[in-house]
Amino acid sequence: MAVTACQGLGFVVSLIGIAGIIAATCMDQWSTQDLYNNPVTAVFNYQGLWRSCVRESSGFTECRGYFTLLGLPAMLQAVRALMIVGIVLGAIGLLVSIFALKCIRIGSMEDSAKANMTLTSGIMFIVSGLCAIAGVSVFANMLVTNFWMSTANMYTGMGGMVQTVQTRYTFGAALFVGWVAGGLTLIGGVMMCIACRGLAPEETNYKAVSYHASGHSVAYKPGGFKASTGFGSNTKNKKIYDGGARTEDEVQSYPSKHDYV
């Protein structure tokens, strides 16, 4: 039950996180005009990964796409790439995790396969979250660097009568959305990985074996076995009751070498 809850919660948290990463990537407010030097401007500037916008006090907003690839800063391209990789990995992770959910039955899928898929999706979510956090952090670092550079420029060479106030940019809402979304995806991924451990069918201490003796039906339970070497450690025990006897484990699922990863 706890495993199902952990897996389900991990999926939901990751889903919210990836939706947030997509939203952040599409948002225009990655950087917004810093109004410290000109708080009374009638024109407000903000920029995203794909276009820059100008909002006038009148309510009119004008956006222009970056219709060039080669002319854009390498850092911006890197951030775009990180965010897209994050989205793609997250989307694949979501697809995989849907089939891995314990509450969803698809044919005769074994628990071992579900465990593997849960782990795979968990790792994908972790990498997706890290990509988003890295992308947003790179952009934030770029903003901080440019902010202080333009501040330095602002206070040099102002001896003339004409002031040319350089537009400075500060953190936009998309950065915070990206950080939170990346964090959620990461947490969701970790939860999936934790759920994977619980999903992997461990061998129990007591093997329940039933066999038929002539005249009586007796349930015989050999005790005292501790699986010390993983799967296959009790094969001798199983072979004793070959004549029609089955362990409870054999009835439910067949152990596989993939169960522990």
Partner: antibody, heavy 116, light 113 residues
Framework: QVQLKESGPGLVAPSQSLSITCTVS????????VHWVRQPPGKGLEWLGV???????NYNIALMSRLSISKDNSKSQVFLKMNSLQTDDTAMYYC??????????WGQGTSVTVSS | DIVMTQSPSSLTVTAGEKVTMTCKSS????????????LTWYQQKPGQPPKLLIY???TRESGVPDRFTGSGSGTDFTLTISILQAEDLAVYYC?????????FGSGTKLEIK
């Protein structure tokens, strides 16, 4: 067509307050902002303030303490209220429609004289 | 506040001549985000309210004759009347609409000989 018409008291005693109404037609106040501009006799134009479609306002800092702009969208009216008038507030007061921060349509103006 | 300085303060010219007046702002009116200069030119004829001529420094308002041309960027702007006509007798104002308060220049009074 677009029209703006100012109506005011004409004469105001010093230290009294001034109220001017700008009645608009041909456009909606929920879509356009309205500016207030004044012009003392024989002098240049002075921007007073603006009220935007959402109801938010911006004022000339020099007059901010005694200036108030409001509106009634349903009546298509914009109101200018100015307190503590002095003789140098004597001017022609205009309201004008905003279009992308420029003023494309102006009213004929209302003359305000501050005198005892 | 942005200070708008217009020159000359008055100008006496003959009909048919080319007229140029300038407007300087104490701060750049160029918005880097959309490459627009938030400067507007108005014409005010005697006894009338001002009339919008040019916005964004160079975009002519519809209905304005093409003899009126606005140019310039940043802090230096020019209004040119290519062939002056008698009806152009007016005061011309430039206005900053980039930063509050929206300040006007003191105007250039155009008189015809």
């Amino acid at each position: 067509q677009v029209q703006l018409k100012e109506s005011g008291p004409g004469l105001v005693a010093p230290s009294q307050s001034l109220s001017i109404t700008c009645t608009v037609s041909g456009f909606s106040l929920t879509s356009y902002g309205v500016h207030w501009v004044r012009q003392p006799p024989g002098k240049g134009l002075e921007w007073l303030g603006v009220i935007w479609p959402g109801g938010n306002t911006n004022y000339n800092i020099a007059l901010m303490s005694r200036l108030s702009i409001s509106k009634d969208n349903s009546k298509s009216q914009v109101f200018l209220k100015m307190n503590s008038l002095q003789t140098d507030d004597t001017a022609m007061y205009y309201c004008a429609r905003d279009r992308r921060l420029a003023m494309d349509y102006w009213g004929q103006g209302t003359s305000v004289t501050v005198s005892s | 506040d942005i200070v708008m300085t217009q020159s000359p303060s008055s100008l006496t010219v003959t009909a048919g001549e080319k007229v140029t007046m300038t407007c300087k702002s104490s701060q750049s009116l160029l918005e880097s985000g959309n490459q627009k200069n938030y400067l507007t030119w108005y014409q005010q004829k005697p006894g009338q309210p001002p009339k919008l001529l040019i916005y964004w420094a160079s975009t002519r308002e519809s209905g304005v004759p093409d003899r009126f041309t606005g140019s310039g960027s940043g802090t230096d702007f020019t209004l040119t009347i290519s062939i002056l006509q008698a009806e152009d007798l007016a005061v011309y104002y430039c206005q900053n609409d980039y930063s509050y308060p929206f300040t006007f220049g003191s105007g250039t009074k155009l008189e015809i000989k």
